[in-house]
Amino acid sequence: SDKLYQRKEPVISSVHTKVKGIAEVTENVTEGGVTKLGHSIFDTADYTFPLQGNSFFVMTNYVKSEGQVQTLCPEYPRRGAQCSSDRRCKKGWMDPQSKGIQTGRCVPYDKTRKTCEVSAWCPTEEEKEAPRPALLRSAENFTVLIKNNIHFPGHNYTTRNILPTMNGSCTFHKTWDPQCSIFRLGDIFQEAGENFTEVAVQGGIMGIEIYWDCNLDSWSHHCRPRYSFRRLDDKNMDESFVPGYNFRYAKYYKENNVEKRTLIKAFGIRFDILVFGTGGKF
Amino acid sequence: SDKLYQRKEPVISSVHTKVKGIAEVTENVTEGGVTKLGHSIFDTADYTFPLQGNSFFVMTNYVKSEGQVQTLCPEYPRRGAQCSSDRRCKKGWMDPQSKGIQTGRCVPYDKTRKTCEVSAWCPTEEEKEAPRPALLRSAENFTVLIKNNIHFPGHNYTTRNILPTMNGSCTFHKTWDPQCSIFRLGDIFQEAGENFTEVAVQGGIMGIEIYWDCNLDSWSHHCRPRYSFRRLDDKNMDESFVPGYNFRYAKYYKENNVEKRTLIKAFGIRFDILVFGTGGKF
Amino acid sequence: SDKLYQRKEPVISSVHTKVKGIAEVTENVTEGGVTKLGHSIFDTADYTFPLQGNSFFVMTNYVKSEGQVQTLCPEYPRRGAQCSSDRRCKKGWMDPQSKGIQTGRCVPYDKTRKTCEVSAWCPTEEEKEAPRPALLRSAENFTVLIKNNIHFPGHNYTTRNILPTMNGSCTFHKTWDPQCSIFRLGDIFQEAGENFTEVAVQGGIMGIEIYWDCNLDSWSHHCRPRYSFRRLDDKNMDESFVPGYNFRYAKYYKENNVEKRTLIKAFGIRFDILVFGTGGKF
C-alpha cells in the first residue's frame, strides 16, 4: 500500500529457470512405403533451448520437413500460388509467403497442378496444419523452478524468492502454497483461465508476473513475492498477424556428400517472467 | 504530457517478433581448379536464431572456415604474429588475438613466413575482411512483425499494439501508416538516418523504441504506441573496441570418424526493441 | 545525489558483449579399452552461445553422454531407483528425476543391480558429479568487453560507456581504471568476494551492475557509469533447488542411418548485466 513518507525504488531483478519433464510422442511414420509406429522421447535438451533468464520456451508441437536440399523445384501449391504459364512467374521475385526465389518458369508440381519453379530448400515446406491434438500435449505436467534474486540498490537491500526453509518437493498453489516457486505448467494455464491442451496446438505466450511490494522499514518489514499469471498473445488474432507462437529452426547434416537439413517448425509456449514492484523505506 | 494530479505507473511489456524474407547469395567457388556458380538460399531458419522477445538478429554477412580439426598447426600470420625462432613462441601462451595455445615452436606457415605452432582448431581462421558488398544485402527487403503486449498492473489495464481493425498486409510508414507494426528493415534504417547496405557489411545494433504515453482516465482516454528508431552501436568506434556486430558459431560433424567443425563468423543487425512509457490515472 | 528540483527519468539501455579467450582441456579418454590423453581446445564458438545483450554465458565445466539412441534400456540406478520386481515399476510413469518413461518392467542394469526399464535416450545419463577442478577453469583469464548505450528519451540525451579517448588494451580496475569496460572474469569474481575456481565447478550467476547517476544540467553535467559486481545465485542453496547454473543441450547426428545424439550437461557462469539509474534535469 502507498506510504507517502517512504522513498520508493524500483526493483532490479535476475531470474533463473529450470524446466523438468519428459514427453513421449507416438506417431505413424511412413518409410519406404511401410507405415510403422514411432515412439519419440523428448527431454529438456529436445524441447527447450538455452534461452535467457527472463523467458523460457517449451515446444509443444511441431511439423518437420526432412531431407531438404538446396536445388530447384516447384513451389508448394498453396492457395493462390498455382500458375498456368511462365507469365505468372517473375524471375528473381520472392513472394513473402513462398519459400524460395522464382526462376521465371511455371512447372508441374504433380500430375494436375503447376506452380512457379523456385531456387529453394527443396522439397519446399508443405503448408500443413499443426497436428491436433498437440504432439507434446503431456508438457502440461512439466514443472518449472523459478529462482528470482532482487535488489534495491538505493536501499542496499537484496533478497530472493526461495528461502532456506522452503521444501524442494512443493508445487505452487494460490491458496495452499503461494510461496512455492515450482510451478506445474498446466496449473499456470488454469490460473490464467486458459486451456493448455488448446494453446499447445498453435503455441502462445504466457506471462508469469512476480510482484514485489516491499516495505523495508525495520518496524514493519515485509518483502515477499506475489505470483500471478496472464496470457500475453492475442488468442483472437487475425490469421494475417500470425496467431500463436512458433519459429523455424534447422538441423544441418551431410548425406552422400550433399548438404541437407531437416527444418522444424516448432510450436510452443514462451513463458515471460515479468518482475516488477518497489521497495519503500522511510 | 504531464498531468500532475495523475498517479503514474511504468509499463510492463512483452514483445514477440516474426521476421519474413528470403535471400539468395550468389558466389563463385573454385574447387579442384574448376570455378562454379554457387546459389545459396537463406530463409529464416538460416539467417536468424531463436532469440528472446526483446531483440532479434538478422545475419547480413559471413565468413566461413570449413573443415577445421583439433590438432597442431602454424597460426595465421596476422600483423605482428610472425616469428624467426622458438624464442618468440611461449609454450602455453594464449595471445588474445590468436586462435590457439602456443606449443613453443616456431614453424613454417608457407614458403616465406614462419609463425608460432598452436594447439587449435586447424587450419586456424584467416583474418579476412568481411565481404563487401554484404552477402545478404537483400535483407534490406525483409520485414518484421512486432507484437507488443503491455500492462499497467496498478491500474489493472492491458492493451497491445495490434488492434483487430488493423490490416496484416500493411507496412509501417511514419506519415501514412504510423500504427502498422510490420516494418521493412530498410525503412527502419532510413528512418534512423543510416545506410543499410553499409551497416550490413560489418553488422550493427538498431534500436526500435516503442513509447506508450497512456492517459487512462475515461474522459480523455488515449493509449497507442509511438515508434522511433536509432542506431545503438557506435559507428565511429575504434578498431580495438570491435566495431559492428558479429559473433562466431560452429556446425560440428564427423568425417571418417574425425570430429570436425565449420566455423561461421556471422555479421548482422541485432534489433533491440526498447519499450517504455507510463500510464497515468486520476 | 537527490536534487529535488530536477525531473528524474529512468534509463533506457542496450548492451553488447564480446568474450575473448581460449581454454585447453586435458582429460583421459578411454576408447576401445585404451586410455589416451585428450587435448581439447575451446574457443568462443565452443564455450559460449549467441545470447541476447543483457546476459552472456561462459561454459566452465561439462559432462557428456555420447552416442545416445532412442530405445528401451534400464534406467540409471541412482539412489532409490533400484527395483526387485515389476511391482516397483509403473507403466507410463515418469519420475521427475528419471530420464525416461517406465514400461512397467524391472530389468538388470548390471550383474548386481536391477532398475525399471524405460523408453528413453539410451544409455541414460549417468548421475556423475561435475568434474573437480572444473575442466575450463582457465576461463578465469577470459575477458569480456561490455558496450552499453543509454538513452533518456524525455531529456533527449544519449551516451555510451565507451568514450573515443579510451584505450582498447585496458583492463578494468576499481581504483586504477574504473572506466575501462574490458573485464577479466576472474577479477569480476574477486571484486564480488567470490572464488572463480570454486564456482566454475557447478556454475553460477554473476551480476555486473552498471549504475548511471546522471546530472544533465549544463552547469554541472555528469554522466558516467559506475560498475559493481555481486553474485546472484544462492551458494547455500539446498540440493533440491538445483544449486549452481547448468543446462543440457544436444548435438544430433546420424550413424549407419540411426539418429543419435551427444548430450552435454554444460555448467558455467551466466553473467547478467543489470543497468539502472536516472537522468535528472531542471
Epitope: 536440399v69 530447384l72 516447384p74 512447372v107 508440381y109 552422400n256 550433399v258 | 554457387g38 | -
Partner: nanobody
Framework: KVQLVESGGGLVQAGGSLRLSCAAS????????MGWYRQAPGKPRELVAR???????WYEDSVKGRFTISRDNAQNTVYLQMNSLKSEDTAVYYC????????WGQGTQVTVSS
C-alpha cells in the same frame, strides 16, 4: 564433388531419334534437380528440360511431346530421349545439376541433318 559426363550425341537425320545420357558421380542425383541445356552456334545457352526430385518434369515449348527426360537413381544417370528431331535441335547439349552449386558436364554435340 559432383561430376557429370554426357554421352549419346552424334549425327542423325531429321525425324530420327537420339538418347543422351548423363552419368553423375560424387553424390546421388535423387537429391536434386537435373536438367539438359543446349547451345546452338551464336546463341545463348537455353534450358530444354528439367526433372525434379518428385519425378515431375518441365519442357521447353519447342520440344514438348518430342523429348522426354527421365532419371535412373540406381544408375545415378539422367537421360534425354529425343524423338522427331529437327534441324533446329542442332546444338551442344549440356547436362546440368543444381545442388547449391551449378554443376555442368562438358557437353555432347547433336547434329540433325536435313
Amino acid at each position: 564433388k559432383v561430376q557429370l559426363v554426357e554421352s549419346g550425341g552424334g549425327l542423325v537425320q531429321a525425324g530420327g531419334s537420339l538418347r543422351l545420357s548423363c552419368a553423375a558421380s560424387g553424390s546421388p542425383i535423387s537429391s536434386y534437380a537435373m536438367g539438359w541445356y543446349r547451345q546452338a552456334p551464336g546463341k545463348p545457352r537455353e534450358l530444354v528440360a528439367r526433372i525434379y526430385t518428385g519425378g515431375t518434369a518441365w519442357y521447353e515449348d519447342s520440344v514438348k511431346g518430342r523429348f522426354t527426360i527421365s532419371r535412373d537413381n540406381a544408375q545415378n544417370t539422367v537421360y534425354l530421349q529425343m524423338n522427331s528431331l529437327k534441324s533446329e535441335d542442332t546444338a551442344v547439349y549440356y547436362c546440368h545439376g543444381r545442388v547449391r552449386y551449378d554443376y555442368w558436364g562438358q557437353g555432347t554435340q547433336v547434329t540433325v541433318s536435313s
